[in-house]
């Protein structure tokens, strides 16, 4: 069937439309287009006889039409008057006529709309505002947007006049937003510029800040007032009902008790004509004295003395507070507070109790802090340490020893060699030493305040020959895959090279072996049973060398999964069953057996004479290493057959 399709159906003014012909019959003589729904010579647009290749314009031809050989008609520069029906009249070669009608609609390209308002400054909770989208356009749809969102559902919002007018009843400050209108028709859509609704509101009840109402004498009073309002409110201050000033902030420096009273802020909106007030009551207190700390013992001795710290002055009905190291008091049996919290007692002071200590007096407004107090705790001397740690020296070098002991006040030092007093200094220096300088070197530290003394003795050997070294270990029985072992080569000697051997070979390269401390220490990480070897350390310098006796590492391991022998699992009735269990382990494990889950004997070998089919079942060997704390087990199934029933069976042991 001959049909006409309009592309597009809705056409914008000034654009073009194609009346596209479908199912055009073959063997045509010609065709003609008409404006309207019927063939009318007065409304012919164009006619075309195919054989002539020449079209003939009709009375309705506007010059904007182009006819195509496939009978389609293009109309350009569309005008509003082009809207409507178009009829194609086709004449076939057999002179039989056929007709089809198509149509399209023409719409104007919409102009950019604008919003008009009946009230540019509506008052909150009082006025209504009507927005109208201009211009009024036929066949246009009107839409509204608030803050670029579609209109919210609200009983205060009403659309009218074909949605062209948006009315907001009883406006609120929340209606202050960006409003846009949009016009749409089938061929275009245009949005207006934003209109911002300026709602007049307030003032709300003002808020006075800061909120605190208690002040100390001598402080500055700085009050600020704010009330939500559009346009912004004008502010006035009253003190005890008397007008002070027309500002948003009220400032009174260096207040006294006389400034106590009621402070009123009044907010006024000149556009709405409304006033709101808020009152706050301010109380000014006299300044309390600054506290300070007294002590009953300014130089207490560690582990002997107690100290009582008292917060001064004593004031009735006052709360006293304490801080140590800028923290509130820790819970400790050595800290005691008096009933009124004014005295803090430290029982059996330690060097860590130095402080600082602060006390505070709490009043209605704040806490006044004392200056910090630091305790001078007398302690020590602790056991002195002599450095360096070398005990072996070569002749001709200088011997320089230093002594230090923790002490308050600092310790006084004395040096003795083989019991004979040498000098009263912290350092001992002897140049160009010989074998005669070997001996016992004693450092004595003395605290003159506590009267305590402590000594440390060091053996110094001066020799051209290096001594035979020895190996010390931090772990004599390490557990496999768990422990690390550190071997140290003794003694520590100046200008000495340290060497290590394992089973008579130089150290293998391994990520588990690490040398440190100038090669003096050899650490084995994650020891294994293969590390149970002979370890030797050596020391050497330019004139001599020496090796230690070997130290064999005793690595605790296992027990591994046990093995039951013999491997046979089938036996003849009447044979002897002799099962032996073995598991690699250090130390040797403890063995136990279970038959069908029932505990048997704690031996490595299980022996049963003259077995019968009753001895069928599961035989489990359990191994346990008390040193490593590890266990293991294995299960074996034993089958006993009546004599002569199955060839190839074991005759037993």
């Amino acid at each position: 069937k001959l049909t006409i399709e309009s592309t597009p159906f809705n056409v914008a003014e000034g654009k073009e439309v194609l009346l596209l012909v479908h199912n055009l019959p073959q063997h045509l003589f010609g065709y003609s287009w008409y404006k309207g729904e019927r063939v009318d010579g007065n409304r012919q647009i164009i006619g075309y006889v195919i054989g002539t290749q020449q079209a003939t314009p009709g009375p309705a031809y506007s010059g904007r039409e182009i006819i195509y050989p496939n009978a389609s008609l293009l109309i350009q520069n569309i005008i509003q008057n082009d809207t409507g029906f178009y009829t194609l009249h086709v004449i076939k070669s057999d002179l039989v006529n056929e007709e089809a009608t198509g149509q399209f609609r023409v719409y104007p390209e919409l102009p950019k709309p604008s919003i008009s308002s009946n009230n540019s400054k509506p008052v909150e909770d009082k006025d209504a505002v009507a927005f109208t989208c201009e211009p009024e356009t036929q066949d246009a749809t009107y839409l509204w947007w608030v803050n670029n969102q579609s209109l919210p559902v609200s009983p205060r919002l009403q659309l009218s006049n074909g949605n062209r007018t948006l009315t907001l009843f009883n406006v609120t400050r929340n209606d202050t937003a960006s409003y846009k209108c949009e016009t749409q028709n089938p061929v275009s859509a245009r949005r207006s510029d934003s209109v911002i609704l300026n709602v007049l509101y307030g003032p709300d009840a003002p808020t006075i800040s800061p909120l605190n109402t208690s002040y100390r004498s001598g402080e500055n009073l700085n009050l600020s007032c704010h009330a939500a309002s559009n346009p912004p409110a004008q502010y006035s201050w009253f003190v005890n009902g008397t007008f002070q000033q027309s500002t948003q902030e009220l400032f009174i420096p260096n207040i006294t008790v006389n400034n106590s009273g009621s402070y009123t802020c009044q907010a006024h909106n000149s556009d709405t004509g409304l006033n709101r007030t808020t009152v706050t009551t301010i109380t000014v207190y006299a300044e309390p004295p600054k506290p300070f700390i007294t002590s009953n013992n300014s130089n207490p001795v560690e582990d002997e003395d107690a100290v009582a710290l008292t917060c001064e002055p004593e004031i009735q009905n006052t709360t006293y507070l304490w801080w140590v190291n800028n923290q509130s008091l820790p819970v400790s049996p050595r800290l005691q507070l008096s009933n009124d919290n004014r005295t803090l007692t430290l029982l059996s002071v330690t060097r860590n109790d130095v402080g600082p200590y602060e006390c505070g007096i709490q009043n209605e407004l704040s806490v006044d802090h004392s200056d910090p107090v630091i305790l001078n705790v007398l302690y020590g001397p602790d056991d002195p340490t002599i450095s360096p740690s070398y005990t072996y020296y070569r002749p001709g070098v200088n011997l320089s020893l230093s002594c230090h002991a923790a002490s308050n006040p600092p310790a006084q030092y004395s040096w003795l060699i083989d019991g004979n007093i040498q000098q009263h200094t912290q350092e001992l220096f002897i140049s160009n030493i010989t074998e005669k300088n070997s001996g016992l070197y004693t450092c004595q530290a003395n605290n003159s305040a506590s009267g305590h003394s402590r000594t440390t003795v060091k053996t110094i050997t001066v020799s051209a020959e290096l001594p035979k070294p020895s190996i010390s270990s931090n772990n004599s029985k390490p557990v496999e895959d768990k422990d690390a072992v550190a071997f140290t080569c003794e003694p520590e000697a100046q200008n000495t090279t340290y060497l290590w051997w394992v089973n008579g070979q130089s150290l293998p390269v391994s990520p588990r072996l690490q040398l440190s401390n100038g090669n003096r220490t050899l650490t084995l990480f994650n020891v294994t049973r293969n590390d149970a070897r002979a370890y030797v350390c050596g020391i050497q310098n330019s004139v001599s060398a020496n090796r230690s006796d070997p130290v064999t590492l005793d690595v605790l391991y296992g027990p591994d999964t046990p093995i039951i022998s013999p491997p046979d699992s089938s036996y003849l009735s009447g044979a002897n069953l002799n099962l032996s269990c073995h598991s690699a382990s250090n130390p040797s494990p403890q063995y136990s057996w279970r038959i069908n889950g029932i505990p048997q004997q704690h031996t490595q070998v299980l022996f049963i004479a003259k077995i019968t089919p009753n001895n069928n079942g599961t035989y489990a060997c359990f191994v346990s290493n008390l040193a490593t704390g590890r266990n293991n087990s294995i299960v074996k199934s034993i089958t006993v057959s009546a004599s002569g029933t199955s060839p190839g069976l074991s005759a037993g042991a």
Epitope: Q53, Q54, P57, I66
Partner: antibody, heavy 118, light 106 residues
């Protein structure tokens, strides 16, 4: 897109014959007529006539009756202009143009220069 | 045959300016007037058909008007690429006629 491509320039002696081609593409050749236009050196355009590509019937204006012939090779979508017994005054650029169904020429070839000189 | 009188035969104008060409016919051609732009070495280019209908893709700087026997063609806001020869064509009867052409210089 619709294109008309003409053959290259020709240099002929008086009395000879020339045949210019115009190959169409981008549309159905037999649905639009083909016109021929002459532009003599320094002169304006002169419409020579047209050929109905559906029926093959040519139309010539009086000035171009006799020695001038329009023809078609429909299978090749090509129109031809043949000028017999060339004269010096035939020296010109010849354009082919597609004839819209209403009569004006909407698409043109690039032109073919014919020079007649002894 | 319908006779065509195109004037002027040449004219000069300034960039950004406006020019107008006229065509008179010996009889009423019922608005079947077309206007062409022709540049050397190229085929003519159809600008306007049926007196005033602009061909697709032709800038709106070009315009045409007229009826009966008097027709005009205008270019406003002249640009350098407008340098060409312009021809009118009547296609009212089956014997078409070009005007003599107007050479535009800038």
């Amino acid at each position: 897109q619709i294109q008309l491509v003409q053959s290259g320039p020709e240099l002929k002696k008086p009395g000879e014959t020339v045949k210019i081609s115009c190959k169409a593409s981008g549309y159905t050749f037999t649905t639009y007529g083909m016109t021929w236009v002459k532009q003599a050196p320094g002169k304006g355009l002169k419409w020579m006539g047209w050929i109905n590509t559906y029926s093959g019937v040519p139309t010539y204006i009086d000035d171009f009756k006799g020695r001038f012939a329009f023809s078609l090779e429909t299978s090749a979508s090509t129109a031809y202009l043949q000028i017999n017994n060339l004269k010096n005054e035939d020296t010109a650029t010849y354009f082919c143009g597609r004839k819209d169904l209403l009569g004006f020429m909407d698409y043109w070839g690039q032109g073919t220069s014919v020079t007649v000189s002894s | 045959d319908i006779q065509m009188t195109q004037s002027p035969s040449s004219l000069s104008a300034s960039l950004g300016g406006k020019v107008t060409i006229t065509c008179k016919t010996s009889q009423d051609i019922n608005k079947f007037m077309a206007w062409y732009q022709h540049k050397p070495g190229k085929g003519p280019r159809l600008l306007i058909r049926y007196t005033s209908t602009l061909q697709p893709g032709i800038p709106s700087r070009f315009s045409g008007s007229g009826s009966g026997r008097d027709y005009s063609f205008s270019i406003r806001n002249l640009e350098p690429e407008d340098i060409a020869t312009y021809y009118c064509l009547q296609y009212d009867d089956l014997t078409w006629t070009f005007g003599g052409g107007t050479k535009l210089e800038i």
